[in-house]
Structure formats: structure tokens, C-alpha cells
Amino acid sequence: MMTGTIETTGNISAKKGGSVILQCHLSSTMAQVTQVNWEQHDHSLLAIRNAELGWHIYPAFKDRVAPGPGLGLTLQSLTMNDTGEYFCTYHTYPDGTYRGRIFLEVLESSVAEHSARFQIP
């Protein structure tokens, strides 16, 4: 039975050219996290963090995706095209798969504030 819940940074905004941390957290379960996948709006792969193999960054993003902190992901040199949904998929044992969603809005404005509060989607 899957008892866990994914908490995410929810809806966040960040400045064009800046960076943002995408973070999910699995709680309320003792399940072992074996892998976390990070995907973009169109379900294209950004990165994978495997417990035994480490990080795999999709080659096209190697220059502007940094692993971490923790199981999260730091997206750098943001462009307007980075606006959209991001998904974290947690593979766990014995529970199975959990999924979280984050919406990132990249703003032109130089006064854009980066809000990052944990919330359950």
C-alpha cells in the first residue's frame, strides 16, 4: 500500500537568466528511494538520480542543469522557454512510483521574485 506523499515547491517564478531549484520531497513512508527522474513539460528527460549509479544529466542540458541539492535539481541560465511544468518521479521499494508536479514561470522583469514554498499539489 502506498502511504507516502510528494511535497514540492509548487508554483514558482524566477528571473530570466537566473537559476532556480526544483525540489520534491517524499514523506510519510519508509520506502527506499531507488531512483528519481526529472522531466520537463513535454515529458522530455532532464535528469535521473539513481541511488547506486549517481546522476545522469540529459546531454543537451549538461551545461545548465546542476545536480542537487539532494535529490533536487538546479536549472541555470533560465530562458522564457523554460516556463512550464516539471515533474519528479520517485521510484521506491516496496511502494512503487510517486509523482510530483512543479510549475515554473520565468519572468522578464528584473524585479521578479523567486517564491519557493513547499506545498502538496
Epitope: 531507488t34 528527460l45 535521473i48 539513481n50 547506486e52 549509479l53 545522469h56 540529459y58 546531454p59 549538461k62
Partner: antibody, heavy 119, light 107 residues
């Protein structure tokens, strides 16, 4: 097109070391990891390790920890694997292979380097 | 370690036949499985990744299916150039391991 060209065959004595090279072309070297796999005569495939050409960090199969050492020279887009304390059962064809876009699989392979260990 | 078991270890088939090779993982690997083809004296070549995705340049007669522990490689209509040895490999943990291989021979 993506190409991996490996160094030539080697004959070594037991206890010696060997360093195999793998020269990459046709892609941005630092965007991919380089994997090493071996195949003993008439046998199947055995993964040794991989190295992230961007960071230089390596991940080894436990069996090859301390036996294989992976390095890269990004200035010449070349990966290396050094094997130490060679034994006769290290006789095999050693392959380098570029990692896949979507995970830890092997997208493009070198032609292989035969390493023979014999006294 | 995750063990990969292929079956059969060898098979004989004719040109035009439909050929199926199976690969079983000792624990769930979701869809993190790839297939390779190797001809004698040559390096292996990637055929399938993530259980069912074909790299560009691989003929559409090759297909993959399965998830969890059970996977299948299918060649819909065997061609003369398909006689080779096929290996599966998981990419879900350390060590990455391969199946023992399936040799496809001419009947």
C-alpha cells in the same frame, strides 16, 4: 557521425598493467559518459565502469574497484582505462562505449581492443 | 546484484520468420532495459533502449516490450543480416549487468 576509435591490441605478462585509449569524434565529448565493457573469448559482456567526461567522476562495478582506473583528457576527446595486476583471466576484448541520452545504456561502441595476458 | 536471464540461449530460424527473445530480471527494473546485437568479431550495436525505444537507424522490424521483470525483443521478419547474438542489459543499478546472450542461427 559519432565514432570511437580504440588503441591497438596488447600482449602483457601477468602482474603488468595496460592502458587502453578511446578517441571520440562527431559529438561534444563532455556531454556524455564513457563506458568500458569487456568480453572474454567466447563469453558474454561484462560492464567494468563509466566516467562522466564533464566532471571526471567515475563509477565502477565492485569487481573492478581498484583493478580499473578511468580517466579522460577532454582537450583531445579521449578516454582511457588502465588495468593493473593483470592475470590470465583478464584476457578479453575491451570495448569503450558512449553512454545513452536517456540513462545508463551504451549508445555507440568502439571497435574493441584485444588484451592478451600470457607468460 | 540484479541478474538478467535470457531465453532461449540459442535458436534456429529462417529468413522471414518472426523471432522472439525474452529477458527476465531478478527484480523490477521498471522499463530500464536495453537490447544489443553483436555479430562475430564485431562490437555490439544498440537496438532498443528503455525497453521499447528504437535509436535512429535501427530497422522497424525490431521492437521491444515489457516492464518490471519480463521483457521481449521481437524481430517481425528475420532478415539475413539479423543472424547474430542478442544481449539484454538493465540500466537501473550497480552493477549494470547483461544477459548471457541469445544466438540466432540459420535453420
Amino acid at each position: 557521425q559519432v565514432q570511437l576509435v580504440q588503441s591497438g591490441a596488447e600482449v602483457k605478462k601477468p602482474g603488468a598493467s595496460v592502458k587502453v585509449s578511446c578517441k571520440a569524434s562527431g559529438y561534444t565529448f563532455t556531454r556524455y559518459s564513457m563506458y568500458w565493457v569487456r568480453q572474454a573469448p567466447g563469453q558474454g559482456l561484462e560492464w567494468i565502469a563509466f566516467i562522466d567526461a564533464y566532471s571526471g567522476g567515475s563509477t565502477y562495478a565492485q569487481k573492478f574497484q581498484g583493478k580499473a582506473t578511468l580517466t579522460v583528457d577532454t582537450s583531445i576527446s579521449t578516454a582511457y582505462m588502465e588495468l593493473s595486476r593483470l592475470r590470465s583471466d583478464d584476457t578479453a576484448v575491451y570495448y569503450c562505449a558512449r553512454g545513452g541520452d536517456y540513462g545508463w545504456y551504451l549508445g555507440v561502441w568502439g571497435q574493441g581492443t584485444l588484451v592478451t595476458v600470457s607468460s | 546484484d540484479i541478474q538478467m536471464t535470457q531465453s532461449p540461449s540459442s535458436l534456429s530460424a529462417s529468413v522471414g520468420d518472426r523471432v522472439t527473445i525474452t529477458c527476465r530480471a531478478s527484480q523490477s527494473i521498471y522499463s530500464y532495459l536495453s537490447w544489443y546485437q553483436q555479430k562475430p568479431g564485431k562490437a555490439p550495436k544498440l537496438l532498443i533502449y528503455n525497453a521499447k525505444s528504437l535509436p535512429s537507424g535501427v530497422p522497424s522490424r525490431f521492437s521491444g516490450s515489457g516492464s518490471g521483470t519480463d521483457f521481449t525483443l521481437t524481430i517481425s521478419s528475420l532478415q539475413p543480416e539479423d543472424f547474430a547474438t542478442y544481449y539484454c542489459q538493465h540500466h537501473y543499478g550497480n552493477p549494470l549487468t547483461f544477459g548471457q546472450g541469445t544466438k540466432v542461427e540459420i535453420k
